[in-house]
């Protein structure tokens, strides 16, 4: 189903963006890239 495919793709993209910021902060000590509280 196309909606499901879109949702899965977006979920993967969102995770990758979050993980990139996480890795930059914890393994790269790039604190300016931290995710701020909502």
């Amino acid at each position: 189903h196309s909606d499901g495919i879109f949702t899965d793709s977006y979920s993967r993209y969102r995770k990758q963006m979050a993980v990139k910021k996480y890795l930059a902060a914890v393994l790269g000590k790039r604190y300016k890239q931290r995710v701020k509280n909502k």
Epitope: V19, K20, Y22, L23, V26, L27, R34
Partner: antibody, heavy 108, light 109 residues
Framework: SVEESGGRLVTPGTPLTLTCTVS????????MTWVRQAPGKGLEWIGF?????DAYYASWAKGRFTISKTSTTVDLKITSPTTEDTATYFC??????WGQGTLVTVSS | AAVLTQTPSPVSAAVGGTVTINCQSS???????LAWFQQKPGQPPKLLIY???KLESGVPSRFSGSGSGTQFTLTISDLQCDDAATYYC??????????FGGGTEVVVK
């Protein structure tokens, strides 16, 4: 500081929640990570929770664990433990300040 | 998912000597976000090196890291008895998060 608690002997399938209590750490400014280590084995990354409260997991851990937090604690729920989940569970601020770990033993 | 392979294990050297530990990734480590940890029995891991070559605050300069892409190295020079431990590499993987190597035991003779 970071301190884990809640580890104990449980039977397979019995949900268990581990708690990571922090002091002197603003959880709105740091990532908190859970890592485990089976007896005599290496380190295994489970996942993390960000400042906004969103949690992300290794693919093998998704559905098996749930990470959540309050203002001073970070919880790791093992939803349906199996014997393969027997390990010491570590909580870390980023990956540079770690607790001593808490031992979970899953056995019938 | 990236698989990190550490060699050799175990590795031994005399006090004052040098040991080199290799960490090879099955795919390129994202951003060269590769860290090295030291772990002693009954203790949590301790961060030594981050971003492949940057020394964590308070860690002796006898520890150094190098490498990029898929091949990384930890070097311990002027080996001390206190350096006896297991060392782990950990690399960034945007699909999985963090992948740990299997660990390398360092024995000081």
């Amino acid at each position: 500081s970071v301190e884990e608690s809640g580890g104990r002997l449980v039977t397979p399938g019995t949900p268990l929640t581990l708690t990571c209590t922090v002091s002197g750490i603003d959880l709105n400014s740091y990532y908190m990570t859970w890592v485990r280590q089976a007896p005599g084995k290496g380190l295994e990354w489970i996942g993390f929770i960000d400042a906004g409260g969103d949690a992300y997991y290794a693919s093998w851990a998704k559905g098996r664990f749930t990470i959540s937090k309050t203002s001073t604690t970070v919880d790791l729920k093992i939803t349906s433990p199996t014997t393969e989940d027997t390990a010491t569970y570590f909580c870390a601020r980023d990956l540079d300040l770690w607790g001593q770990g808490t031992l979970v033993t899953v056995s019938s | 998912a990236a698989v990190l392979t550490q060699t050799p294990s175990p590795v031994s050297a005399a006090v004052g000597g040098t040991v080199t530990i290799n960490c090879q990734s099955s795919e390129s480590v994202y951003g060269n976000y590769l860290a090295w940890f030291q772990q002693k029995p009954g203790q949590p891991p301790k961060l030594l090196i981050y971003e492949a070559s940057k020394l964590e605050s308070g860690v002796p300069s006898r520890f150094s890291g190098s490498g990029s892409g898929t091949q990384f190295t930890l070097t311990i020079s002027d080996l001390q008895c206190d350096d006896a431990a297991t060392y782990y590499c950990a690399g960034g993987d945007i699909s999985e998060g963090v992948a740990f190597g299997g660990g390398t035991e360092v024995v000081v003779k």
